[in-house]
Amino acid sequence: MMTGTIETTGNISAEKGGSIILQCHLSSTTAQVTQVNWEQQDQLLAICNADLGWHISPSFKDRVAPGPGLGLTLQSLTVNDTGEYFCIYHTYPDGTYTGRIFLEVLESSVAEHGARFQIP
């Protein structure tokens, strides 16, 4: 039975050209995290495997950095980075947990970094 829950930074905004940290946290379960996959819409960005460490997709290597922890840092943000991001936690023995983050990249300096909103 899957008892865990994923907490995320929810809906966040950041300035064009800046950086943002995508963070998810799995709680309320003793399951072992074996791997975390980070996806942007229909693209695999990165994988963190308990045995193998990090793999960053080559096409994102210049702008994606592993960490902190199981999170992911996006750098040199562009307006095209606006959209949904998913953290997919593969755990044993529970199975798979998925968290969602919506990032909006803004042109101006009105971006509110790390703002937390309720995920719909």
């Epitope: 074996t34 791997q35 996806e39 229909d42 695999l44 045995d51 193998l52 793999h55 593969h90 044993y92």
Partner: antibody, heavy 118, light 107 residues
Framework: EVQLLESGGGLVQPGGSLRLSCAAS????????MHWVRQAPGKGLEWVTS????????SYADSVKGRFTISRDNSKNTLYLQMNSLRAEDTAVYYC???????????WGQGTLVTVSS | DIQMTQSPSSLSASVGDRVTITCRAS??????LNWYQQKPGKAPKLLIY???SLQSGVPSRFSGSGSGTDFTLTISSLQPEDFATYYC?????????FGGGTKVEIK
């Protein structure tokens, strides 16, 4: 250098059993998921079964479920496939493959031929 | 199960030609799509993983694109050693499934 070497194939009668082995070298075997894939003569590739690095997760194709058993011995760097109740349609070359991050099969063995015939 | 439909099933081309092979998934598989090359009597060889990442040691004339349900393998300039059969494979969910293969033959 990563190497995967299958063995144990051969001719067996319908209803018989075989145990395939895949000896791994050149990498930390215990860190990788492993898969078996087969290819019938003149046909395409068919995934058979997979096992996670610590053997916590195992999955089978419907066509072999209940008849085949995948296992691994990380202390011996060896992957196994126990095949029971073999049928003519199981005739194929069987490949073992290393699967980093459970996403792609980056190294394959040379294959071992299993022929099920009376 | 996720069905993978590859087209064409075979094609004839000349050295230097640009070759495109397509693969369609019966449902979205994000970018969990790999391409393999197989020559007669040999094991498959990984070319492209995660839809567009070139496997180490594979020539840059091979490229992959697509996401969701539609994917493409492109060989920019066909070389003599590229005549082989190519397979796509999804790793989005088990059972893992392969396309039926595309045989690239000499014209």
């Amino acid at each position: 250098e990563v190497q995967l070497l299958e063995s144990g194939g051969g001719l067996v009668q319908p209803g018989g059993s075989l145990r395939l082995s895949c000896a791994a070298s050149g990498f930390t075997f215990s860190s990788y998921s492993m898969h078996w894939v087969r290819q019938a003569p003149g046909k395409g590739l068919e995934w058979v079964t997979s096992i996670s690095s610590n053997a916590g997760y195992i999955s089978y194709a419907d066509s072999v479920k209940g008849r085949f058993t995948i296992s691994r011995d990380n202390s011996k760097n060896t992957l196994y496939l126990q095949m029971n109740s073999l049928r003519a349609e199981d005739t194929a070359v069987y490949y073992c493959a290393r699967v980093p991050y459970d996403v792609w099969m980056d190294y394959w063995g040379q294959g071992t031929l299993v022929t099920v015939s009376s | 199960d996720i069905q993978m439909t590859q087209s064409p099933s075979s094609l004839s081309a000349s050295v230097g030609d640009r070759v495109t092979i397509t693969c369609r998934a019966s449902q979205s598989i994000s970018s969990y799509l790999n391409w393999y090359q197989q020559k007669p009597g040999k094991a498959p060889k990984l070319l492209i993983y995660a839809a567009s990442s070139l496997q180490s040691g594979v020539p840059s004339r091979f490229s992959g694109s697509g996401s969701g349900t539609d994917f493409t393998l492109t060989i920019s300039s066909l070389q003599p050693e590229d005549f082989a059969t190519y397979y796509c494979q999804q790793s989005y969910s088990t059972p893992l499934t392969f396309g039926g293969g595309t045989k690239v033959e000499i014209k």
